[in-house]
């Protein structure tokens, strides 16, 4: 999906008002220095591509993020403010709804969410030069 036509300011507002708090709640008890940020993004559409991938694509050691509150809010935000996004995600979403796996917060998931926090922070500062 091409995130170019998204309403970035509305997504940013949703992140600042609610998604960021859910990410912090998920990471509670974890030191902010515990994980190094290894995933980066260069502009807002690229950041949303990376955020979507890390949030909704199961990875080795972390298959359960899609049912977390921050993920559900992210999906709703992309659906509401990125035209046509939801139609490209139908099959993935139906599969997600069928996989009602028990939520397990593994160290790998914590690392992944730490990467997400970094991507979201970068999304909110699009004019900063890449480090």
């Amino acid at each position: 999906y091409d995130f170019t036509n998204c309403d970035f300011e509305k997504i940013k507002a949703a992140y600042l008002s609610t998604i960021s708090k859910d990410l912090i709640t998920y990471m509670s008890g974890t030191k902010s220095t515990e994980f190094n940020n290894t995933v980066s993004c260069s502009n807002r559409p690229h950041c949303l591509t990376e955020i979507q991938s890390l949030t909704f694509n199961p990875t080795a050691g972390c298959a359960s993020l899609a049912k977390e509150m921050f993920a559900m809010k992210t999906k709703a935000a992309l659906a509401i403010w990125c035209p046509g996004y939801s139609e490209t995600q139908i099959n993935a979403t139906q599969a997600m709804k069928k996989r009602r796996k028990r939520k397990v917060t593994t160290n790998k998931c914590l690392e992944q969410v730490s990467q997400l926090q970094g991507l979201w922070r970068r999304f909110n500062r699009p004019l900063l030069k890449q480090q």
Epitope: N5, M72, A76, A77, A79, I80, P83, G84, E87
Partner: antibody
């Protein structure tokens, strides 16, 4: 089967506001975006905006920004569209619409429409 | 805003005819194009989404094609219940916009 039932016809004075309701039944309400589309007499269709009921995220067409407010009450599975500062050109049938697919913005279920007449 | 232009604005046809309605977008909308049918006094009904996917329950005589800026709705053999107004709608960018409609009338 999803059903959307809208409130009845309204006659309003210019400058006033109108609030139209849309009650959903037959299926979960929260995870499906509800849109509002209007149609002036003998005219085409015009998208006004939509809401994600679960989290209250809204998106409005620029044309209606500042005049329209879309809300949703999860406890009653009802969405609302309020239009303020009414003028005669707001006379139209107002439809709520939603998809049968999770978070989709396709309009495959529609309310029966609510005629709003703005007249002095 | 993306402008959607339909042609013709109205047409007369007989039962059994093959009918083609075109829709042009003012900019590239990929395949984010849907078609709706509306009968007098009724809400619109989704026929085609994603330019060519037939909505569940819609007869196979309806088909859609195109991508980019030019799209077509075809009714292969017009039936009495198909006399209505047809609208195209883009969902590539907000605000979502509709064509002005094409009225299909009985000849």
């Amino acid at each position: 089967q999803v059903q959307l039932v809208q409130s009845g016809a309204e006659v309003k004075k210019p400058g006033s506001s109108v609030k139209v309701s849309c009650k959903a039944s037959g299926g979960t309400f929260s995870s499906y975006a509800i849109s509002w589309v209007r149609q002036a007499p003998g005219q085409g269709l015009e998208w006004m905006g939509h809401i994600s009921p679960e989290f209250g995220f809204t998106n409005y067409a620029q044309k209606f920004q500042g005049r329209v407010t879309i809300t949703a009450d999860e406890s009653t599975s009802t969405a609302y569209m309020e239009l303020s500062s009414l003028r005669s050109e707001d006379t139209a049938v107002y439809y709520c619409a939603r998809s049968g697919m999770f978070y989709s913005i396709l309009f495959d279920y529609w309310g029966q429409g609510t005629l709003v007449t703005v007249s002095s | 805003d993306i402008q959607m232009t339909q042609s013709p604005s109205s047409l007369s046809a007989s039962v059994g005819d093959r009918v083609t309605i075109t829709c042009r977008a003012s900019q590239d909308i990929y395949n984010y194009l849907n078609w709706y049918q509306q009968k007098p006094g009724k809400a619109p009904k989704l026929l085609i989404y994603g330019a060519s996917s037939l909505q569940s329950g819609v007869p196979s005589r309806f088909s859609g094609s195109g991508s980019g800026t030019d799209f077509t709705l075809t009714i292969s053999s017009l039936q009495p219940e198909d006399f209505a107004v047809y609208y195209c709608q883009q969902q590539n960018d907000y605000p979502l916009t509709f064509g002005q409609g094409t009225k299909v009338e009985i000849k």
